[in-house]
Each structure stands twice: as structure tokens, then as C-alpha cells.
Amino acid sequence: NIDVCKLGTVTVQPAPVIPLGSAANISCSLNPKQGCSHYPSSNELILLKFVNDVLVENLHGKKVHDHTGHSSTFQVTNLSLGMTLFVCKLNCSNSQKKPPVPVCGVEISVGVAPEPPQNISCVQEGENGTVACSWNSGKVTYLKTNYTLQLSGPNNLTCQKQCFSDNRQNCNRLDLGINLSPDLAESRFIVRVTAINDLGNSSSLPHTFTFLDIVIPLPPWDIRINFLNASGSRGTLQWEDEGQVVLNQLRYQPLNSTSWNMVNATNAKGKYDLRDLRPFTEYEFQISSKLHLSGGSWSNWSESLRTRTPEEEPVGILDIWYMKQDIDYDRQQISLFWKSLNPSEARGKILHYQVTLQEVTKKTTLQNTTRHTSWTRVIPRTGAWTASVSAANSKGASAPTHINIVDLCGTGLLAPHQVSAKSENMDNILVTWQPPKKADSAVREYIVEWRALQPGSITKFPPHWLRIPPDNMSALISENIKPYICYEIRVHALSESQGGCSSIRGDSKHKAPVSGPHITAITEKKERLFISWTHIPFPEQRGCILHYRIYWKERDSTAQPELCEIQYRRSQNSHPISSLQPRVTYVLWMTAVTAAGESPQGNEREFCPQGKAN
């Protein structure tokens, strides 16, 4: 709040703008008849230094010259870059109570002369764009610095534009508002940037360019594709381009891909035939343009065209599996399962599957279409049956896949040996086996089939399977494998007309079960105790249960309990024990064991056998 210097003046030598590292002398002078009213000799002029409106120093000790009561000169040094405010105040020393009165103030700017601008780069976006140049201004000057961009061209044409940098804005780019037409393709242009501020000036080196050097074509627009005869693999890509474009680059990829197919097209005139597209696939297409075969810059990529190629008839064969269940003495239920074709084989939306069951000798044929990936029929148990399935989309059907219906586990000689299941990691299980020892006929293929061992899984969930060539003896199963779940795994060996299988349980990761089995009843029969239990709920098993343990001890005894270990079988839910004394009260409980350890004990039951013990 300086009152426009009524009391006096402040001047700076050599100037209010000084280079970094320089000193300045600030003189504060009172106007005639101004000052302390009664005692001019008591006038004391003080100089205060402010940075960002904060008082940082009283320069009382920097006084280099003093006309008592009239003027004082102060030397200021070590000023930092930017602006510093100095305020001169009058202190009437006879009046201690009155604060010093502002006389006048001055701002000193400290900065540097501009460096020559460097790295000039000019562009004109499109044939109708304007020339814009950018440059590197070098070190910040901390002063208002004016920049002039000057362009010189053929016929001595020149033009220029100006801007400035200060502490609020930076000037390192200017648009000249000039458009260079293509008929200047051979001409040379020169640009130069000049920087000037209160401490000096500098000029860039001249930067020379041609039309082709700086004109970046606009990206192509209005991109579209026409599929020849609704083909899913061939299409003509079309687009609009600026008139002078001679070279295009096309890139396209399926939407889920990570690598582009690239094509260069010379004199395409907005049209290019593509012949290697995948049917029924979402594609992304982009195009870039260039004005000259050897020189010039590529345009930015166009906006993406996203479209799906048309369908074509399915290729490839379905992977089929089946289950057989006898219903009564003359009927069996056949459940067929198949895996969906992958997109590159389906080549369209699969509308339905054509399923055929045929009795080979009597020529009985059952046919149906379904939209599901399974089909169940009841057929006679007699005769040799074969099944076939094909997939259909809007353009046609795949070749049918045939499979002979045999008794999958009917031939013991075909059963694979030494089947093992090892957990590889959280998501898969490695199954290995040895071939059947005395197979009558050659193994055509192995099928590894697995299903979660949970209630109702046979009826609720289709099986998972892998087809393995006959010379392979291992399979890594991962589809729908979850940790802490026990799977029944079957390895089938199939010949032309027979099948044999071996079964094993396995898990990909295991923990000790959460709880033990629940003893539901203890009954005494013929001097033996039968312990009955309910199995541990499926979510609490946490892997494959290897065996159960039945513990017992005399009530109130502190001795170690006795135990009996039973191999786990799903179908078993009772077991006899016969080493208990009659008319002694026992406490019994059970635990379950996985490969990771033993569960906590289940419920305790007390029982006092009545009969005679062994």
C-alpha cells in the first residue's frame, strides 16, 4: 500500500532490471518540505526488502551514502532470480510510538539474457493446415522475453509472428497462419527465432525445410469395408484421403490380438483388397498416409474402423465323449457330450448341432438337433452303436465326428496301469499311467476324464475330458480344476471296439479338513461295535480324504486313545471295531486325513458295550 510516492522518490542504478550476480544501488530521496515535521535532522530513511509480499530484510546496514534527513543510498547484492520489492520508509526517531511511514518503492527484476532458441521444428497438418513451429527456449530468463518467429520463402516472401514468455506463460510455439500449397513441393523455406529481453537478445540458427519435410497429411477418414460376396476372408477396404497422398500404410488386427498385420499400398487411391481375414472375427482397421514415396512424414493413424467379418461354414471336428448307464436288463442311457468349436473353427455363431445315433447292423437311426453341447437318449442294450455330431452356423455345417459306443470300462485287459495323480500347482493336476499289460487289441487313444467328487456331480455337471494319443502316458488337466477340491479321475484306454479304465482321486492343492466325520450311531452286533457316520460336508473336506480314523478311550482316562484307520471309500459309512471291553464306558470320535494332515476331531459319542468282548 504505497501512496503513489507523495513523500519522495526511489531510483535504481544501473537499472531496475539487472543480470544475476550484479549489485544495484537504490536511492531514496524525500521531496522538499517532506519528512519529520519538527526535526529534519531526525529523518531516518530505511529500506525494506520484500519477496512474495513477505518482509525478508531491513537493509539498514547496507547504507552506502547518506544526506542526513534528505536522501539515502543503499547497495543491494545477492539478489535471487525473479522480482524483489524494495520499500523506502521514513522513521521519525523522536516519535517512538509512530510506525515508519512509506515513502516510495521499486521492483528490481533479476534475470538472464535469453539463450539462442534451438531445435526448431515446424509442421503443417494437412494440405490446408497452417505452418506452426516450436522450439526450445533454453534456460528460463525470469524476465519478460519476446520471441519472434520469422519465415522466409520463395520470391523473397517473409512473414513473422510474436509471443512472449513471463512468469505466467511460456512461449515456445507459434502458428504463422500461413498455408503452404503443394505446388511449393520443391521450394525451400527458412525459419529463424529471435529472443529479446531487457538484458540482451539472441537468434537461432536458420532452420531450412521443404514442403515435404513439414507437411503431415491429415489422417484418412470415412473408412469402410466391403466384403466380396459376403466372404468372411476377403474384403475391400476403402477410405478418403487428401489429394496429394501417394503412399498408405494399413494395419489391422483381430480385437483381442496384440500384433498388427501391416501393409504398404502405393497409389491406392483410397482402396485396397485384403485376402487373409478370419471369418466371423471382430477386426480393427487403421490407415496412415504419406505425400511422397521417399520423403515426408506419415500422418497420424486414422480413427479405427471396427467391424466383424461375415460368417463362413464351420471347419474342424468336434471333440465327442459319452457316458453309458444301464437302466434295466434290456435298456441303456447314452449321454453324449461335445466341446464347443473354438472361434477359428466355428467361423460364425453355432446355431445348432446335428446328432445321430445309429445301430450299425440293424440300420436303426436316431437323429435330432440341439442347441446344447450334450444329448441323452435311451436305447437298447443290444447291438453295436455309433454316434456322430456336427455343428451348424448360418453358412453350413462342419463334417460330422463319429465315435463308437463301447463299454468304457468293460475290458479289464485294457485298463491302464499305475495311474497316479500329482498336484502341479493350484490350477492343475498331472496324471500319469502305464499302458495296459495284455491288451488284445491296439489302444487307439486314451481319454482322461475328471469330475468333482461332490454330491450330485454326475447328474448336475458334464464330465471334463482330454483326448491323448496312444503313445503318450501323461496328461496335465487344468480345465475347471480348483484348489481344495477332490476329483475323480479316470483314464480310459479305447480300442476300435473295446474300452478299459482305471480310476484315481486327485486334487491340485489340499489342506487338512475343517472338521471330522459326525458319528451318527454306535450299534452292537454279535460282540462287535458298528460305528456309523456321515461324511464331512463337501466344502469342508479341502482336498481328497485319504482315510478316516476312529479313536476311542475309556471315559475319564488320561491314557492315549486307541485308533483304527480306515481307507476312505465314498460308499462306506460304517465300520466295525472289536477290541472294546464290555460294561466299560468309552468315548469315541473320528477324524479325517488328507495329504496335508488330520482334521480336528468330530463329535464325541459315549458307548458302553454290553456283550462279551474278544
Epitope: G153, N156, C159, I178, N179, L180, S181, L184
Partner: nanobody, 126 residues
């Protein structure tokens, strides 16, 4: 809206002088190319002289060098063409053009490059 208004045309004897003016309105005058063009009946429009208002560079057609002078008055937003030693070949409609925003190989002489045009003023030399 930019408007260019020419004045100062008329009839004059061979060897005489005329001074054409072009008043620009609705227009930022600095750092622009402004030019004078002429078109005789049945002929193409040709560049006579041009000036760059940002730096004072001037350009002249060979046929008028040393006879015509182009100048400007920034304060009045006005462009001038002083024509001395006029000949019957100088007879034409004279147009004022402003803002050379598209550079062709003809440079300042190419009328396609200018953004704004006046209605013209007739000069007849007998």
C-alpha cells in the same frame, strides 16, 4: 466482418499520376501481407505490388518498378498505391487484397493465396 474499400481511381492522361487507397475494417492490420492487383478486360488478374505490414517488406512487379510505390498507414488501417508515369498499359480495374494465407509458387503475385478482396476501382489512362 472484414471489408476492404478501394478509392482514388479515375481517368488520367499518359504520364500522369494517381494515388489509390484501400481502407480496411474489421481486420487486425499488423503482420499481414496486403497487395494491389489489377485486371484488364480479357486478361488474368495480375499482382502489381505487395507489402508485409509486420516488417515493411515490399514487392513489385517488373512492369511497375520505379513507377509505383506501395505504402501503409497503420494508424488509419489504410493501404496506398502511388502510381506515377502512367501509360495506357496501366489501364485496368485495380483491386486491394489482404491476408496472404496460402503461399503458392507464384508467391505474393498469386491471387489464390489472398483471403480478402475489395470491390475494385477503375483506372483509365489515355
Amino acid at each position: 466482418q472484414v471489408q476492404l474499400q478501394e478509392s482514388g481511381g479515375g481517368s488520367v492522361q499518359a504520364g500522369g499520376s494517381l494515388r489509390l487507397s484501400c481502407a480496411a475494417s474489421g481486420y487486425t492490420y499488423s503482420n499481414r501481407h496486403m497487395g494491389w492487383f489489377r485486371q484488364a478486360p480479357g486478361k488474368e488478374r495480375e499482382g502489381v505490388a505487395a507489402i508485409y505490414t509486420g516488417g515493411g517488406s515490399t514487392y513489385y512487379a517488373d512492369s511497375v518498378k520505379d513507377r509505383f510505390t506501395i505504402s501503409q498507414d497503420n494508424a488509419k488501417n489504410t493501404l496506398y498505391l502511388q502510381m506515377n508515369s502512367l501509360t495506357p498499359e496501366d489501364t485496368a480495374m485495380y483491386y486491394c487484397a489482404a491476408d496472404l494465407t496460402r503461399w503458392y509458387s507464384g508467391g505474393w503475385r498469386d491471387p489464390r493465396g489472398y483471403k480478402y478482396w475489395g470491390q475494385g476501382t477503375q483506372v483509365t489512362v489515355s
